[in-house]
């Protein structure tokens, strides 16, 4: 992937739109949308000041860990859906899109240098463990996906892209 492709706001917006669509199709869906287990996902809440004051390398650690955990969670959701007796087609489609989207975002972040950034800061080893919550429905899973993109990921790329411009 081109190193700074994710710095084009339209790129992130595309994935964000997909995540919101996925969240919307699960609104009011009970029957097909239970995960039947609790899946660990990143906590997407952001204390805006605290986040902005973080070193960009520390932000990278949190985004990288969050993205890895979220990818794992969506893959688990996909496996549960495949194993269900009658997977609901629209849900299957959006789960597959989310898996693909998270893979692409991982590639784009790697190209931006997020992985390198996440390994290099001296305080990376002493970083606070990633805060997590659980999702028991696809709606919650997609909401976490959407919030992660709107929050930590967008804030991090904004900062990393600006730093790269200097």
């Amino acid at each position: 992937a081109p190193p700074r492709l994710i710095c084009d706001s339209r790129v992130l917006e595309r994935y964000l739109l997909e995540a919101k669509e996925a969240e919307n199709i699960t609104t009011g869906c009970a029957e097909h949308c239970s995960l039947n287990e609790n899946i660990t996902v990143p906590d997407t809440k952001v204390n805006f000041y605290a986040w902005k004051r973080m070193e960009v390398g520390q932000q990278a650690v949190e985004v990288w860990q969050g993205l890895a955990l979220l990818s794992e969670a969506v893959l688990r959701g996909q496996a549960l859906l495949v194993n269900s007796s009658q997977p609901w087609e629209p849900l299957q489609l959006h789960v597959d899109k989310a898996v693909s989207g998270l893979r692409s975002l991982t590639t784009l972040l790697r190209a931006l240098g997020a992985q390198k950034e996440a390994i290099s800061p001296p305080d990376a080893a002493s970083a606070a463990p990633l805060r997590t919550i659980t999702a028991d429905t696809f709606r919650k899973l997609f909401r976490v996906y959407s919030n992660f993109l709107r929050g930590k990921l967008k804030l991090y790329t904004g900062e990393a892209c600006r730093t790269g411009d200097r």
Epitope: K45, V46, N47, Y49, K52, R143, K154
Partner: antibody, heavy 117, light 107 residues
């Protein structure tokens, strides 16, 4: 002790300009942001915007964008809120507050601005 | 723009528990903050990051936040707790939004 001291009350006429100040002491001024909050008579709190004096980054509430200007002079640990043309509806108490991980954790005493013809 | 809604008033007898609510679309996805303002005074932060208390705030003050609602709970209410209470939150974009405020009356 963290202190934010605001400039005194102002009485102005519609159309006049005004700049009020907020001086921080007892802490590193550039290590925190300063936020501005409006409280109209008998009403609630309204966030106007914040400034990061270190990076000179400013964010305005959509309701106040274009209506006021927020600035800071880090050399004298002071933040400012200014109007180029006051309206009667700008009559209110204006508070500055320090923004930290505990947002708006220390407040100024407030500056009462009265705009009347 | 994001909107936070609070009840205009809440009444409670001394020694009882007061609960003040704040609702907003998916508010549980954001941190909630609570301020106390007494007449003629500047506001004071009483709860941050949903449930944390700044130093100097009594343990009687607690907070929770999930779904669309954040709640400030004041246990063993005292006459000195009578004040206006405001909730607030950060948006992902960096805006800080205040609720309309709730007047707490101690009967």
């Amino acid at each position: 002790e963290v202190q934010l001291v605001q400039s005194g009350a102002e009485v102005k006429k519609p159309g006049e300009s005004l700049k009020i100040s907020c001086k921080g002491s007892g802490y590193s001024f550039t290590s925190y942001w300063i936020g501005w909050v409006r409280q109209m008579p008998g009403k609630g709190l309204e966030w106007m915007g914040w400034i990061d004096p270190y990076r000179s980054e400013i964010r305005y509430s959509p309701s106040f964008q274009g209506q006021v200007t927020i600035s800071a002079d880090k050399s004298i640990s002071t933040a400012y809120l200014q109007w180029s043309s006051l309206k009667a509806s700008d009559t209110a108490m204006y508070y500055c507050a320090r923004v930290s991980s505990e947002p708006f954790d220390s407040w100024g005493q407030g500056t009462l601005v009265t705009v009347s013809s | 723009s994001y909107v936070l809604t609070q009840p205009p008033s809440v009444s409670v007898a001394p020694g009882k528990t007061a609960r003040i609510t704040c609702s907003g679309d998916k508010l549980g996805d954001h941190y909630a903050y609570w301020y106390q303002q007494k007449p003629g005074q500047a506001p004071v932060l009483v709860i941050y990051d949903d449930s944390k208390r700044p130093s100097g705030i009594p343990e009687r003050f607690s907070g929770s936040n999930s779904g669309n609602t954040a709640t400030l709970t004041i246990s063993r209410v005292e006459a000195g707790d009578e004040a206006d209470y405001y909730c607030a939150t950060w948006t992902f974009e960096g805006d800080y939004v205040f609720g309309g405020g709730t007047k707490l009356t101690v009967l």
